[in-house]
Structure formats: C-alpha cells, structure tokens
C-alpha cells in the first residue's frame, strides 16, 4: 500500500481541506521536473525561472548566463537551441501547434561572438522543423515541405528537395499518420554523429484519401481542415529513405538507400533510423501486417556516393504471438565497435529483455532475464549499460534504472535507484551527459517528485535540482486520497489495480465506485506515480472509490498478457474490466448500485462496451472522444492489433467489435458521449455514428461537443468538460452540489 | 576536355620504390575518386585501390595492403601512387582513372598509362 | 574476391555481324537498386574505354550499337553491327565489392 504524502495527526485534521474541483483546473497541485540540456560531459543548459539561458558546469561549480532574457523577450522566443560549436543560439517564437508532435515557428539566429542577430539571409517564415548540426553550425530546416541547408547561419541556404507540396509530398517532417502513429516525432530528419551526412525520409501521401472536417471559426462560412489520413485497409504513405552529404551537397545529391527486399515485395513502413558512425547508417523497416522487422545496417561507399545495405547486415525481428515489438519496435544501442547492438525484444518465455546481437539475430546474447520487463536502454558506454526495468519487488508499475557492467566478466548488475528514496521514488527515468559522465533521476513518484543530479561513476547524488517544496508545502493542508497498488489473480490472469480512497475510507462503509480505463494495447494505467488531479479530487472531495484496472493486452508483464488482444480489439480489455469490477464488490465496500465507468480515446471505446455489456453492473458512464469502429482509425495503429478489414483476413471482428453493434445494450445505462468536432485523431465520425445508431434504436443519451477542439479537449474545453462530467457523475451517483 | 596525363616510364631495381604521378585537368579535381589500375604484359587488369581528393579517403586491394601508397596534391590536382618493396612481377602499365560521376565504380577517363619495369 | 569469367575468350566475327559476349559473377553483383557491372574496350597500345556502366547504361560518347544487359550473376554485352574500329578486348568489371575485379577480357578479332 502507497499511502501519500505522509499524513498528519488527527489533531490537525480540522485545519485540513479537501481538494476541490478549482484545484484541479487552476493546476494549483502542479509538479515541476528537471531535465538538463546536456551540452558536454559535464555541463548542461537550463532556463531560470526569469527565463535567462543559463551554463551550469558540474565540475567547476560555475554557471553563467549565456542568453539574457531581455534577448529573449525582444524576439518573444519560447524556446532556444545553442549551436554545438557554441557561437549561435536559436531563438524560436510564433509557436503554432499543428498535430500531437508538430508545430509551426519563426526562428531568428543570435550571434553570441558578437551579441547581435544574425542579418542577412534570414529564415523564412514559418518554418515547420529546424536543427543544428551535431558538431558546428550547420543548419537543416524546413520549409513548405521541402529540405534546406545552411552551411553557416549567415549564408544563403541550398535547397535539398524541391518536390515538397502541402498534403502531397513532405519532405524531413511526417505526415499525419507517421507523426502520429509510427515516429512519435515532429522531424524526419537526422544529422550523422558529426555531421557529414543528413538523412531524411520522404512521405507521399499522394494517393491516400483523405478525412475532411468544418473548423467553424468565427467567420461566414466554416474552412474545411483536410489531412490525408489513412484508416485501417486503406492506402498507406509511400516512405523513401534518402541521405546527402552536406560537405558537397550538389555533388551526387541526395542518394536513396535500399528497402531491404523482403520487405519491398508488399506494402511497407519505415520505423526508424539510427546512425552508427559518419559512415554507417541503421534503418529499420516494417511490413504494413506488422508482425515481421528488419534492422538493416547500410554502409556509405565513396565509390558509389550512395550506401550499400549487404542482406548479410540484415537483422529480423518476427513475432509469431502478436505483433513485432511493444507499442513501437524498440530502436537499436550500438556499442563502440559500432556493428553490435543492444536491443530489446521478446525472450523464449515471451517477455522484453535485452538481447547483444552481435552477427545474427538468431545468436543473440540475453542480457537480462526473469519475469518482468526490460523497458528502455538509456545508454550504452565503454563499460557500462543504463536501463529501466520493472524487476524491483516484482511490482509492474514502478520503474527502476539499472547498471550493468559490461566490460566485466561476468557482466554485474546494480540497481542505481532502487533504495535511494524507497517510499517517495519507485518510478524513474534518467537523463545521461556525454559518455555518461553525468545523469539526471527524474523521480515521478509515488510521492512528490524529485529531480537529482548524479556521478555516472559512482552513482553518487551530487546535488537536488528540483525537489517540488513549495508544492509540499501547499499539499500539508490537503486531505488528499489514499493510494493502493495490489493485483487480483483471476483464472491464471493477474489484474493489477490501483485504488483511490477517500481520506476517511472506512471499509465498513459503501462508497460509489468509479473506474477510469485506458486500456489500449501496450498501454499501462496502474503505475506508482504522483498525481493530483480530477479522480483525486473525486476521491478526496466527493468520496468516490476510483479505480484503475490494467487488464489483458497491457504491457509490462509479458507477452501473454500483451498479446491476447491480437486480432480480436474490444473483447478482454472490457472482460477484465468487469472481472475487476465483481472482484472489488467482493470486497464489501463497494455500492454496487453506484458504479460508473469513464475513459477517454480508446478508453473511451472500452468505457462504451463496458456499459454496453449486458452485465447490468454500471449505472452510468462516460465516453470522451471514443473509438467506436476501428474500420474509423489510423491504418498504422489498428493493423497493428487487428489485422486488416478484408474478409480474408479480420473483416468479421472489425464489424464484431464496433460500439454501433451494440446500441440497444445502452438502454439500461446512463451514458454520457464527448468528442471534439475538430478531433484530427479520433474522427467526431466516431461519435457521430454511436450517436445514429443511438437514435436509430430510440436509446435516450446526453452528448456534449466541443467546437474546433481537437483531441485532447484543451483551454476553456478542459474546464467545461471536467464540470460537466462531474455534474454527471454526482447526478448518477446521487451526490448533493 | 577531362584528361589524365600520367608521368613516363620507370626502370626500377627489385626492392626499390617507384612513384608514378597523375595530373588532372578539365574537371574540379577534389570531387572524383581516382583508381589505380595496373596490366601485366599479355595479362588482363588488376585494381590497386583509389583516393578520394577531396575528403582524403583511402581503399587498398588487399593484396598490395602495407606496400602502396597514394597521395594527391590538390593545389596541383594530381595524384601519386607509390609502391614500395618492387619485384619482378609488379612489372606492368599502371594506370590511373578518373571515377565516374554515375557510375558507382565504372572508370570514365583513363590516363594513357605509365609503363614500370623491375629488372635486375 | 568476386571472380569474373568471360566467354568465349576468343570471338571471330566479321564486320557487320552480331556480337555477344558474355561475363558470369561467381556471386550477385546487384542490389535492388543497381548493377555493379561495367564494359571496357581496350587496343592494342591503348588505355582501356568505358562503354556500358551499370550493366546497361551507355556511357557519352559511345555508339549506340553498344549495349548491355543482365542483372545478378550473368550479364551480356552486345554490338549490334560491327564496325572494323569495334575489334579489340574487352572486359567486364564488377565494383559491388572489394577488390574491384575484372574478368580475363574477351577477344573479338575480323574473321
């Protein structure tokens, strides 16, 4: 049991409040983390709190500013990147958010040797990625689709690519789906380790049709927002890899490198590129059925002025259980022989462990092992090998960072975090200087988060870079809600869960039960983190019992778990849900006749099957811009689970498993359907079609738009949307205003 | 006009070193990868390796690894070959060429060859 | 090393006839992409010509009646019509891997 933060005396209870719904939406209970911006070994880069641009030097001691904020303010910038040479500064403003990852900016290059902006050939405007080169001051940006370099921030700039059109060809950045569901990037471009090379990715979304909505706006007539979008069974984006050599940039051009044959034979994607050295490049490829991988490592030859990708440096990664991979397909760690590599995959008893693949996949070398996962390689150096795992006192919800020594015989492990700060820290990641000389512990929780600074060979703290105090401090008046994280083991399935209580849980007494479900595949609800936010404030406020059920298809505790939702979405994900529900009836504390469910985006779908269930379980619930068909959503992610809608392969559990199927079911329930009409992921044509085929069965429901909001409901929405549901759920459970 | 003018023949003792130059003109030097090719009498073509002018980069057959060496001057635009430790069967035509700005490893110009003989 | 074998290693034609030479890699000089193989005509006295690089691309400057095809192990070259200036040797050479090799030339002499 996690009980947090530690409680005060009863004596001073009656000094104490609970959470209200204004907390909530004000972020009044907000925590701040510290990433540093690693620049060498042994300094980073921060912005203080009146925005200066600050050098910290760990070993001297020593900081100073490097960028005033009055410089800052005089360009509105939001943002600055430094050049790796360190004599020019980026300076971003105009930021315009366009989908989860990308955005729109103007930059303005500052001269640091001279104080002064740099005139003449200036960037345009708005530019939709830009970069420094690895070493110097090269710059690769782009602009209306199409790739420009410059060799220093004063010169005029070389176009790289000149077939770029808006909603056509995007050159260096992705296009919706690959943003969205494959790199989880907004750039599609990558430096090579000192810049001699830039590689990029070229998407034509050409043929792919496209999803077109109203964006109301405030003027006459709505625009009409259109994005090639592929959904599941449609046609994909055609990826092409290309390299240049930004020292001659004209001279050969750019030089595409090969897909690796057995994947060029049907329809492919492009998952990622890793560089190795100057002259050695890694792609990875993935066939459109996403159960099959290459790793295809690529040599530059200067005799051809393009890369050669022998079949002898093909790696491939094939999942006969489910699909290839986690959520994505885990990314290679070279080591310094720089052929070799550490990655993560699935091991013979079918959990995520790192593998040494030194000449074949097939001869691997496991590095970890056991019953538990292997979640992220931070950094692989001479010696060493960071990761993060979910091994510690077998609990899948924390995250730990490990070391293992690899340039010893038996290599030895050592959990860095484990007993730093047992209680407060369980769930970390870690952010490495160069060569590891350094690192940042970003501890999450389960108490208020922490951020240190640490010796990469000792392990040594060397200092609190953010420890959250004034939030602390505003938390001591707070009753906040019991936290407990335990498992229910159900016909060979564990179900972990997390519980929030109210401050005065009694367990003699009944309480209204609300789950909160995600549930998408790979995805993880149940983990040993702090948060203050809207079920908190149920819990503390409205004394609701909220709980969060990680169910089959979850990730983290092996592939059986994992997997069991291939190809048939909808099914256990909502049977375990249910499964939960009966279980924590049992425990005695539960009103069964005051039980609702919510989710939001595939959470959203779950939360809508559940009611639509039959069980008779849940008096009420809520769907937030809900799935409800999976022939409605992106190709990328749903062929990944489900297969394709053809009748020869899944046809029959896409239509199986849409919430339209289950109309009449919502009789009995009291559901309440949200969606943004300006939702560019999850259509409002989900929504849309639950609310026909509602009507169409004469079933009574409440719905709530959003105008021109998009998927995650921000700004004023966030306000609105949070009291209306809790309105909802008072009502549906009863609860005075 | 893109042209290779190689240096004259060379009459070496074996054990001795000879150093054959190759100077280009019509074309900017420092982009093209110059090859080295030699022809035994009656015999066919052997590659020796090739130099990249302008990022230095080096490849040597294997089997002439540690006894050749080639160099370009960029101020000149030429090359230089150099092998080292001769015998009576590196006696030949060697040749320089230019590589092929598409060619991926075809040779498009070739030098008029430069005729080395070791004898004792 | 990739070995390449020419056939025949001798040709007698007469001007105006076919010609097809042949050259054969001991393993694949082509990736998907492209054909690592290129034909050189040498006489007598002379440094060796480009005609054909990349299997089937005819080099500037060369007669139309000289092409090239093939693709793996097994490539052809082929003069259509041949002219008194076309007889001389000719080789194949593969730049797929390291070393670079070429084949032992073909002879093509007047009948």
């Known amino acids: 049991i996690v009980l947090r933060p530690s409680r005060v005396h009863n004596s001073e209870e009656n000094t104490m409040r609970a959470l209200t719904l204004k907390d909530i939406l004000n972020g009044t209970f907000s925590y701040k983390t510290f990433f540093p911006n690693w620049i060498s070994g042994q300094e980073y880069l921060h912005q203080s709190a009146d925005n200066n641009i600050v050098l910290y030097n760990i070993e001297t001691g020593q900081s100073y500013t490097i960028l005033s904020n009055r410089t800052m303010k005089s360009v509105n910038a939001s943002n600055y990147g430094l050049s790796p040479d360190r004599q020019f500064v980026y300076l971003e403003s105009d930021y315009s958010k366009l989908w989860r990852y990308s955005y729109t900016a103007t930059y303005y290059i500052y001269d640091l040797s001279n104080g002064e902006f740099v005139r003449g050939n200036e960037l345009p405007r708005p530019i939709q990625y830009l970069c420094w080169s690895p070493v110097g001051s090269k710059l690769a940006y782009v602009y209306q689709n199409n790739i420009y370099l410059k060799q220093r921030p004063g010169d005029p700039p070389f176009q790289i690519t000149f077939n770029g059109r808006e909603n056509k060809i995007f050159n260096g950045i992705p296009d919706w789906v690959y943003e969205e569901e494959m790199l989880a990037t907004k750039y599609a471009l990558w430096w090579s380790p000192n810049g001699k090379f830039l590689a990029y990715a070229e998407f034509n979304d050409t043929d792919i049709p496209v999803i077109a909505y109203s964006y109301y706006g405030d003027e006459q007539y709505p625009r009409t927002i259109n994005i090639p979008y592929p959904k599941a069974g449609a046609k994909n984006p055609v990826v092409r890899i290309f390299i240049i050599d930004t020292t001659y940039p004209a001279y050969v051009g750019p030089q595409e490198v090969p897909v690796p044959a057995m994947i060029a034979s049907s329809d492919y994607y492009f998952s990622w590129l890793t560089w190795v050295t100057d002259e050695r490049v890694c792609l990875q490829w993935l066939k459109r059925v996403q159960n099959v991988s290459v790793l295809s490592i690529c040599d530059f030859r200067e005799d051809w002025q393009t890369w050669d990708c022998p079949k002898t440096q093909e790696h491939i990664e094939e999942s006969r259980t489910g699909w290839a991979g986690g959520f994505f397909v885990s990314t290679p760690v070279f080591s310094y022989d720089a052929i070799s590599y550490y990655k993560i995959f699935s091991d013979k008893d079918g959990y995520k462990h790192i593998h040494y693949i030194k000449d074949t996949v097939e001869n691997a070398i496991q590095i970890t092992s056991g019953k538990w996962e292997a979640i992220n390689i931070f950094r692989v150096t001479q010696d060493s090998l960071f990761y993060s795992s979910n091994e510690f006192e077998e609990y899948p919800g924390r995250r730990n960072i490990y070391r293992i020594s690899i340039g010893s015989y038996p290599p030895s492990k050592k959990c860095v975090t484990c007993h730093l700060r047992k209680e407060r820290c369980q769930y970390y990641t870690a952010s490495f200087s160069d060569y590891a000389k350094y690192y940042a512990l970003v501890c999450y929780g389960p108490g208020i988060p922490i951020s240190t600074l640490h010796d990469g060979r000792t392990d040594q703290e060397i200092k609190i870079l953010e420890e959250n105090k004034e939030l602390e401090n505003a938390l001591k008046n707070i009753q906040l809600p019991k936290e407990e994280i335990k498992k229910l083991e159900v016909d060979e399935i564990t179900l972990w869960y997390k519980m929030i209580l109210p401050p005065q849980f009694d367990r003699s007494k009944k309480y209204p039960l609300l789950i909160q479900v995600y549930g998408g595949p790979c995805s993880q609800s149940v983990r040993s983190v702090f948060a203050v936010n809207w079920i908190s404030y149920l819990a503390s406020k409205e004394g609701m019992v909220i709980a969060l059920v990680d169910g089959r298809g979850t990730a983290f505790q092996g592939d059986k778990l994992l997997y069991a939702v291939y190809r048939k979405l909808g099914v256990y994900e909502v049977e375990d849900q249910i499964t939960a529900v009966r279980k924590f009836i049992e425990m005695g504390f539960i009103d069964e006749k005051r039980i609702a469910i919510w989710g939001w985006s595939y959470g959203g779908y779950v939360s809508s099957l559940a009611l639509a269930s039959g069980t008779g379980l849940f008096k009420c619930g809520i769907a937030v811009a809900p799935v409800s068909s999976w022939e409605y959503y992106a190709s990328v992610y749903t062929e990944r689970f489900m297969g394709l809608p053809t009748k020869d392969d899944n046809l029959e559990h896409y239509k199986n498993s849409t919430v339209m199927a289950r109309a009449e079911y919502f009789r009995n329930v009291d559901y309440l359907l949200i969606h943004g009409t300006a939702d560019d992921n999850v259509h409002f044509q989900n929504s849309a079609q639950i609310a026909k085929a509602l009507v169409n069965a004469q079933v009574d429901f409440q719905a709530m738009w959003y105008s021109d909001q998009n998927h995650g409901l921000s700004g004023l929405s966030t306000n609105h949307l949070y009291t209306h549901m809790t309105h909802f759920l008072k009502q549906c459970f009863s609860l005075s205003d | 006009q893109v042209q290779l003018v190689q240096s004259g023949a060379e009459v070496k003792k074996p054990g001795a070193s000879v150093k054959v130059s190759c100077k280009a003109s019509?074309?900017?030097?420092?982009?093209?990868?110059i090859h080295w090719v030699r022809q035994a009498p009656g015999q066919g073509l052997e590659w020796m390796g090739w130099?990249?002018?302008?990022?230095?980069?080096?490849k040597y057959a294997q089997k002439l690894q540690g006894r050749v060496t080639m160099t370009t001057d960029t101020s000149t635009s030429t090359a230089y070959m150099e092998l080292r430790s001769l015998r009576s069967d590196d006696t030949a035509v060697y040749y320089c060429a230019r590589h092929g700005g598409t060619g991926r490893g075809a040779m498009d110009y070739w030098g008029q060859g430069t005729l080395v003989t070791v004898s004792s | 090393e990739i070995v390449l074998t020419q056939s025949p290693g001798t040709l007698s034609l007469s001007p105006g006839e076919r010609a097809t030479l042949s050259c054969r890699a001991s393993q694949s000089v082509s990736t998907s992409a492209y054909s690592y193989m290129h034909w050189y005509q040498q006489k007598p006295g002379q440094a060796p010509r480009l005609l054909i690089y990349?299997?089937?691309n005819l080099e500037s400057g060369i007669p139309d009646r000289f092409s090239g095809s093939g693709s793996g192990t097994d490539f052809t070259l082929t003069i259509s019509r041949l002219e008194p200036e076309d007889f001389a040797v000719y080789y194949c050479q593969q730049s797929r891997e390291y070393p670079y090799t070429f084949g032992q030339g073909t002879k093509l002499e007047i009948k």
């Open positions: 019509g074309y900017t030097f420092t982009e093209n990868i």
């Open positions: 130099i990249h002018p302008g990022s230095g980069a080096i």
């Open positions: 990349g299997a089937s």
